[in-house]
Interface confidence: low
């Protein structure tokens, strides 16, 4: 409790005491009768009047003083209240600012944690990629140091799958040019020998016309690596191959390609489609993975 508030309570008590004094009980009756007889009565009356006057003056003076004190206290209290309200408002504002700052700090911390997590993930990916590249490069080095007859790993940027390496073009060439490109890479246009391989290639090329290593430019359908066509896997579209001549480009359709749904179609070999190169890994066992 503040000192001003204690004083205020004391003032109230004092006021109460003075009220009780003004309303005091009358003197006993037999004594009054005794005093009211003769000159003593006058003297007593004067004395009492004088006493009463003194009392009144004292009380008036004290009351005036008390009123002044009360006014001062009220003013002080009013100022204190205003000051307190201002301080409370100030504290409230500061509290709001602190809250906002806290939220901002929390948000920043959260973002930094997220950034750190992303950096960590990115770093892990880079490390994995680095290890993969390192393994690939060490394998390339081994291949270069060897007599070149054995390939135990895929070239850089080629995808390994089931003991074969695949390279997926992003540009288009005529079938013969695509075939030549693969040969220059010591590979051949992709030869599809199973449903599983079909699905793998299809996943990587997407819904895009893409040449494969199958043609019938010499009559029978023929895989470029010598795999027997007649006994092998086939995935033609219905009614294909049809060796269609209606395209008006001269000649029939002698080269096979993956269509947008993965099934095969025969088409004019001059069309500039994307292509897939394939090369087989040697049977020699691979090095154990570094990770």
């Amino acid at each position: 409790m503040t000192k001003e508030y204690q004083d205020l309570q004391h003032l109230d008590n004092e006021e109460s005491d003075h009220h009780q004094l003004r309303k005091g009980p009358p003197p006993p009756q037999p004594l009054l009768q005794r005093l009211c007889s003769g000159p003593r009565l006058l003297l007593l009356s004067l004395g009492l009047s004088l006493l009463l006057l003194v009392v009144v003056c004292v009380i008036g003076s004290q009351n005036s003083q008390l009123q002044e004190e009360l006014r001062g206290l009220r003013e002080t209290f009013s100022n204190f209240t205003a000051s307190t309200e201002a301080q409370v408002k100030g504290l409230s504002t500061q509290g709001g600012n602190v809250g906002r700052k806290m939220k901002s700090l929390e948000s920043q911390l959260e973002k930094q944690q997220k950034d750190l997590s992303e950096d960590h993930s990115s770093l892990l990916l880079h490390v994995k990629q680095f290890v993969s590249d390192l393994r690939s490069l060490s394998c390339q080095m081994a291949a270069l140091q060897g007599n070149g007859s054995e390939r135990t790993c895929c070239p850089v940027n080629w995808v390994e799958h089931e003991r074969s390496c695949y390279w997926f073009s992003r540009s288009g060439k005529a079938w013969a040019d695509a075939d030549n490109y693969c040969r220059l890479e010591d590979a051949h246009l992709v030869v599809v020998t199973s449903w599983e391989e079909q699905k793998f290639v299809q996943h990587h090329i997407g819904p895009v016309n893409t040449w494969m290593g199958l043609h019938d430019q010499n009559g029978p359908w023929k895989w470029v690596d010598g795999t027997d066509y007649e006994t092998g896997f086939k995935n033609w579209r219905p009614e294909q191959p049809d060796d269609w001549y209606g395209h008006g480009l001269g000649g029939g359709e002698d080269c096979a390609h993956f269509t947008d749904d993965g099934r095969w179609n025969d088409d004019v070999c001059q069309r500039p489609y994307r292509w897939v190169c394939e090369t087989e890994l040697d049977k020699a066992s691979q090095e154990p993975p570094l990770l």
Epitope: D216, Q217, N218, G219, P220, W221, K222, G226, D228, Y229, E230, T231, G232, P241, D242, D243, Y245, G250, G251, G252, E253, D254, D266
Partner: antibody
């Protein structure tokens, strides 16, 4: 209509040469692979050779490899079979046939008889 | 090299169904073509890719292929169907013919 007509057959001595021709009409000759198939008297059919539509690739049966040469002249719509070092076992009717993709041989010419005899 | 085996001859009563077989190792995995050759004439394609018929060939001619045997079926056989029949497949870049079957319509 599609038509194939062979010519150039005849009697020839062993070790000598002969050139067969096959004139094509009724279709775009330069768009099709072409074959030679032979049939010895009273025997079955034997495939001899194939040439791609543009002449860029040729394949032969083992029995004639190194002795026979398949060729074509697309400007003349004509298929050829140059036969060298002929043997008695080469005696047969020689047919030329068109190959429309993976549909078998269709059609065939009427054939020309080659007889290798001394 | 790949070999195709055909029966030398098959007989069928007029109007009945004739079946000519062509045997080969896993032939069901290959496309089989059938040719008809009448005496003194060039062969003509009657069935290609196991079961397809070229235009102009009657519906009476049908084909099937599975396992180690391909079959040419001629229903309601007619006298005009009497001929030699050859099956054919591709083995790498080489065409291989069966020995041929002589169909006799009784």
């Amino acid at each position: 209509q599609v038509q194939l007509v062979e010519s150039g057959g005849g009697v020839v001595q062993p070790g000598r040469s002969l050139r067969l021709s096959c004139a094509a009409s009724g279709f775009t000759f330069s768009s099709y692979a072409m074959h030679w198939v032979r049939q010895a008297p009273g025997k079955g059919l034997e495939w001899v050779a194939v040439i791609w539509y543009d002449g860029s690739n040729k394949y032969y049966a083992d029995s004639v490899k190194g002795r026979f040469t398949i060729a074509r002249d697309n400007s003349k719509n004509t298929l050829y079979l140059q036969m060298n070092s002929l043997r008695a076992e080469d005696t047969a009717v020689y047919y030329c046939a068109r190959d429309p993709g993976s549909y078998g041989f269709d059609p065939w010419g009427q054939g020309t008889l080659v007889t290798v005899s001394s | 090299s790949y070999e195709l085996t055909q029966p030398l001859s098959v007989s069928v009563a007029l109007g009945q169904t004739a079946r000519i077989t062509c045997g080969g190792n896993n032939i069901g995995r290959r496309n089989v073509h059938w040719y008809q050759q009448k005496p003194g004439q060039a062969p003509i394609l009657v069935i290609y890719r196991d079961r397809d018929r070229p235009s102009g060939i009657p519906e009476r001619f049908s084909g099937s292929n599975s396992g180690n045997t391909a079959t040419l079926t001629i229903s309601r056989a007619q006298a005009g169907d009497e001929a030699d029949y050859f099956c054919q497949v591709w083995d790498s870049s080489t065409a291989v013919f069966g020995g041929g079957t002589k169909l006799t319509v009784l």
